[in-house]
């Protein structure tokens, strides 16, 4: 790797941070000599910080160490001391401070219910092929085919409990066995994670915040896709989650409990029940062969209705389709039974928007996600912002600190363990694990949480979205517990093996690594992010789909080869980087490929290619439609009216002489009064909260 | 109201064939299923089988099938029933029979019946 | 096919008398049977149907009861127009039966 530039007459700083094993974070190095680092991760540089203009320190900083991009950015407080203002500039910010944290709540609050709005939206578009994977026949032979089906539908509908309660009814009706399901599970633990990480995208903004934020996102993908790496052969080869389960559920008499307690949704249930409502059993029909299903649309019409109990004759075609012999007989010509029918009235429709509509599913589908995204994405630009402006000086201090530091010695191994309890209870309380990881991914973007302290909190996540499932279990009716109840205990105890495996010995934290290795990839290639997220959620799961469904023969014919390919390359890494001396010459290093095998440059210049002709038309367009541009065609200029991406340009052509960008301040009004907007006088009326 | 007129009493000889009639008014004809029922002289009755006119489905008993062929003119309101290959024991009164009562086999209307006597 | 039998074949009795006919089918029927009446040189008539529900303008002395193999027809004040022969018959299957039938005569 190419030395790290540092200016000409600087002397190194002392002081060197790192970043501790458990996740111990540096003390806050002083004001005044604060430093940045650039956005561009190949070569990172020493900054040169603009001081806020009533300072009257030079420009030139003496550098610090060789920064790492791992460690947290200290959010610098430019505003006036709380002791050192008047009355009413104190009211002032006392008020802004309210104001701050209402708007803060109020865009959390749309935040989660554009999750939950995306969520409808993907199942307005996929659900019902997502229903369609469940009828395969062949999941019940094949866990390979399992594990994707349960992926690909997660995917499709947003939402494990939805994936998982489907689940349930097909093993409660018999068309599914405990043991073919766990595979489905798994694959709904790994398809659940992709919503943190399309909200990790829209952080793309800015390279060190997004390289922590989609870091902090995959850590959630890698941990469980390793878990399933590992345990899906072990279930297999075992059945231990099975028989476990089986074991708990055969000791225990359970009794019909309460349902599990929507905290969340009461909040969030009155908006988004006005945008839209789903009959969701549609899919759950579809995936149980139901033909009148596959013609029915998601989009709930009818709010309230009657449902009426009564019985009809019908013809049957002999007496053996009678429904007891006593309730058989004949007019002469056809033979006659009674069934017992409900008659369902219509009596209020729903208050939504798409009510009257009458469009496809498809239509109110494309229409919600692109909305919600878009939403979504407002809202965490703007969560961040604020965030940004708040959690500044002490109080960031004092809440990286907080969240940050371990316990004392000896107890510093317990911190990791409490934070997993927290993610858990975190994760119940608001009764999803999308929403609590959605909401933790901008704060280890802007740098309150460290990727080692999110990796337990992610953990517990896991943890809090099973014991939610073992309560519905237990609400659910007499013939479905023994079977729901079951499923909710594999879930669980898929997690806690994932987490025996990946957490307690720090070694075995490969997620983090793994993770830290893509989200430095993805902040230097930023379109390698939403590849990531095809080939890993969609292309990857596709491809075994299909492979599974020509044959054992032809799944083990190119998987073999595939699999047997990326050990090679692995084992061949390995002994690269721990003793090369083993190998030849020629084997010591990638060089022996040609660059696009082993490189991402020339693959980034033909995304640039690919994309350029994106770049001048989304010229005047929104922030948030900006910020999609820059993911894809990772190109600064292609947004110049909008703002959001020539800062990066800026940054990114201004590297000999490393100033901050106008966007970057961490205060709104400096960067204003650097670009020449507001007088210097008016920075006094910025306020923090400490 | 109902009524169900039948055709006059028939004298055929052993091996030949008799076709009865019975022309119904006072209801649409294609409506409800049609039954024909033997009485023997001092024996029980037996069902032969029922036509529904709408569609001309029919069903048989099998004692009778290949022998009786029932048939329904909806032009006419008239339904026909044919007995072929006759013999002694086939002397007997046959009645036509509606069933109003929909989806029973419980007849209610019937007609006067028409008397075939099988005599060489 | 399903056989019902009639007890008894005749029976001779007195004006205001309970008269009780019983049918027996060879299988469960359920209760789709239905009662006859049949006067000399007439066409049947529909007294009862679903084992109990009276034809419309049959009198209320008539009533049926049973279900599943044993049924019953019950006059319960015999008067001199309820001399007839009465038949019970079974639509459960195909082909319909009919019982033998009970003669009912005034002493």
């Known amino acids: 790797m190419a030395p790290w530039p540092e200016l000409g007459d600087a002397q190194p700083n002392p002081d060197k941070y790192l970043e501790g094993a458990a996740g111990q974070q540096p003390t806050a190095p002083d004001k005044s000599k604060e430093t940045n680092k650039t956005d561009n991760t190949e070569a990172p540089v020493t900054k040169i910080e603009l001081l806020p203009s009533y300072s009257t320190a030079t420009l030139i900083d003496e550098p610090t160490e060789v920064d790492d991009p791992w460690n947290l950015p200290t959010l610098q407080d430019s505003g006036i001391k709380w002791s050192e203002r008047d009355t009413k500039g104190k009211i002032l910010c006392f008020f802004q401070g309210i104001g701050r944290l209402i708007l803060l709540l109020g865009f959390l609050y749309f935040f989660v219910c554009s999750l939950d709005i995306l969520s409808s939206a993907f199942q307005l578009v996929g659900g019902k092929m997502a229903g369609q994977f469940f009828s395969n026949s062949s999941i019940m032979s094949n866990p390979l085919l399992g594990l994707v089906i349960g992926v690909l539908v997660t995917v499709l509908v947003q939402s494990s409990s939805t994936s998982t309660s489907i689940v349930v009814s097909m093993v409660s009706s018999s068309l599914l066995t405990v043991r073919a399901a766990i595979p489905i599970i798994m694959g709904a633990n790994i398809g659940t994670s992709i919503t943190n990480t399309i909200v990790a995208l829209m952080q793309v903004g800015d390279r060190s915040e997004f390289r922590r934020a989609f870091a902090g996102a995959t850590v959630h993908d890698f941990f469980n896709w390793l878990s399933v790496l590992v345990l899906l052969p072990v279930e297999v080869a075992t059945h231990y989650l099975e028989i476990i389960t089986q074991l708990i559920v055969e000791s225990f008499h359970f009794k019909n409990g309460e349902d599990a307690p929507d905290l969340l949704k009461v909040i969030t249930k009155p908006f988004t029940k006005l945008i839209v409502q789903l009959d969701k059993k549609v899919i759950s029909q579809i995936a149980m062969n139901d033909e009148k299903a596959k013609n029915k649309s998601l989009v709930k019409i009818w709010c309230k209705t009657f449902t009426n109990k009564t019985q009809i004759n019908v013809t049957v075609p002999s007496t053996a389709n009678c429904t007891s012999p006593s309730l058989c007989w004949t007019d002469g010509i056809q033979n006659w039974t009674m069934k017992n029918v409900t008659y369902k009235e219509n009596i209020a429709k729903c208050q939504h928007i798409f009510v009257n509509f009458h469009l496809p599913d498809l239509a109110v589908g494309t229409i919600l996600l692109i909305l919600s995204l878009l939403v979504l994405c407002g809202c965490l630009i703007m969560i961040v912002k604020i965030l940004g402006s708040v959690l500044k000086g002490q109080v960031a201090t004092v809440i990286k600190k907080t969240i940050n530091t371990d316990f004392p010695f000896p107890f510093a191994w317990l911190t990791g363990y409490l934070a997993i309890l927290v993610g858990a209870g975190m994760t119940f309380i608001v009764q999803s694990s999308s929403v609590f990881t959605s909401a933790l991914t901008p704060l280890i973007g802007i740098g309150v949480i460290t990727i080692e302290r999110a990796y337990p909190l992610t953990l517990g996540s896991n943890i809090g979205t099973t014991t939610t499932a073992i309560l519905a279990a237990l609400a659910s009716p007499g013939n479905a517990l023994r079977s729901s109840l079951q499923i909710a205990l594999c879930h669980f105890f898929f997690n806690i093996s994932g987490i025996l495996l990946w957490y307690p010995i720090p070694f075995t934290r490969l997620p983090i690594r793994m993770a830290k290795g893509l989200g430095n990839i993805s902040a230097k290639y930023r379109w390698f992010a939403v590849f990531y997220l095809i080939i890993f959620f969609f292309l990857i799961p596709l491809t075994v789909f299909g492979l599974s469904l020509a044959g054992w023969r032809v799944l083990v014919g190119v998987g073999v080869p595939v699999v047997f390919i990326i050990i090679l390359v692995l084992c061949l890494r390995l002994l690269q980087s721990r003793c090369p001396r083993v190998l030849p010459k020629k084997l010591q290093n990638w060089n022996f490929l040609p660059l696009w095998m082993r490189s991402l440059k020339p693959w980034d210049a033909v995304v640039s290619k690919f994309t350029g002709c994106f770049q001048m038309r989304c010229c005047c367009c929104c922030r948030v439609c900006c910020r999609a541009c820059c993911l894809l065609c990772d190109c600064p200029k292609c947004c110049r009216c909008s703002k959001c991406c020539e800062d990066l340009e800026e940054a990114q052509e201004g590297q000999d002489v490393p100033v901050k960008a106008p966007e970057t301040f961490d205060n709104i009004t400096i960067s204003r009064e650097a670009q020449g907007e507001v007088p210097a006088s008016d920075s006094k009326t910025e306020c923090t909260a400490l | 109201q109902v009524q169900l007129q039948q055709s006059g009493a028939e004298v055929v000889k052993p091996g030949a064939s008799v076709k009865m009639s019975c022309k119904t008014s006072g209801y649409t004809f294609i409506t409800y299923n049609m039954h024909w029922v033997k009485q023997a002289p001092g024996q029980g009755r037996e069902w032969i089988g029922a036509?529904?006119?709408?569609?001309?489905?029919?069903s048989y008993n099998q004692k009778f099938k290949g022998r009786a062929t029932l048939t329904a003119d909806k032009s006419t309101s008239t339904a026909y029933m044919e007995l072929s290959s006759l013999r002694s024991e086939d002397t007997a009164v046959y009645y036509c029979?509606?069933?109003?009562?929909?989806?029973?086999?419980?007849?209610?209307?019937w007609g006067q019946g028409t008397s075939v006597t099988v005599s060489s | 096919d399903i056989q019902m039998t009639q007890s008894p074949s005749s029976l001779s009795t007195s004006v205001g008398d309970r008269v009780t006919i019983t049918c027996k089918a060879s299988?469960?029927?359920?209760?789709?049977v239905a009662w006859y009446q049949q006067k000399p040189g007439q066409s049947p008539k529909l007294l009862i149907y679903w084992t109990s529900t009276r034809h419309t303008g049959v009198p209320d002395r008539f009533s049926g009861s049973g279900s599943g193999t044993d049924f019953t027809l019950i006059i319960r004040s015999l008067q001199p127009e309820d001399v007839a022969t009465y038949f019970c018959q079974q639509y459960s299957r195909i082909p319909l039966t009919f019982g033998g039938g009970t003669k009912v005569e005034i002493k």
């Open positions: 036509i529904y006119p709408g569609s001309g489905d029919t």
């Open positions: 029979s509606i069933s109003t009562i929909i989806t029973t086999g419980a007849v209610d209307y």
């Open positions: 299988q469960d029927v359920g209760t789709a």
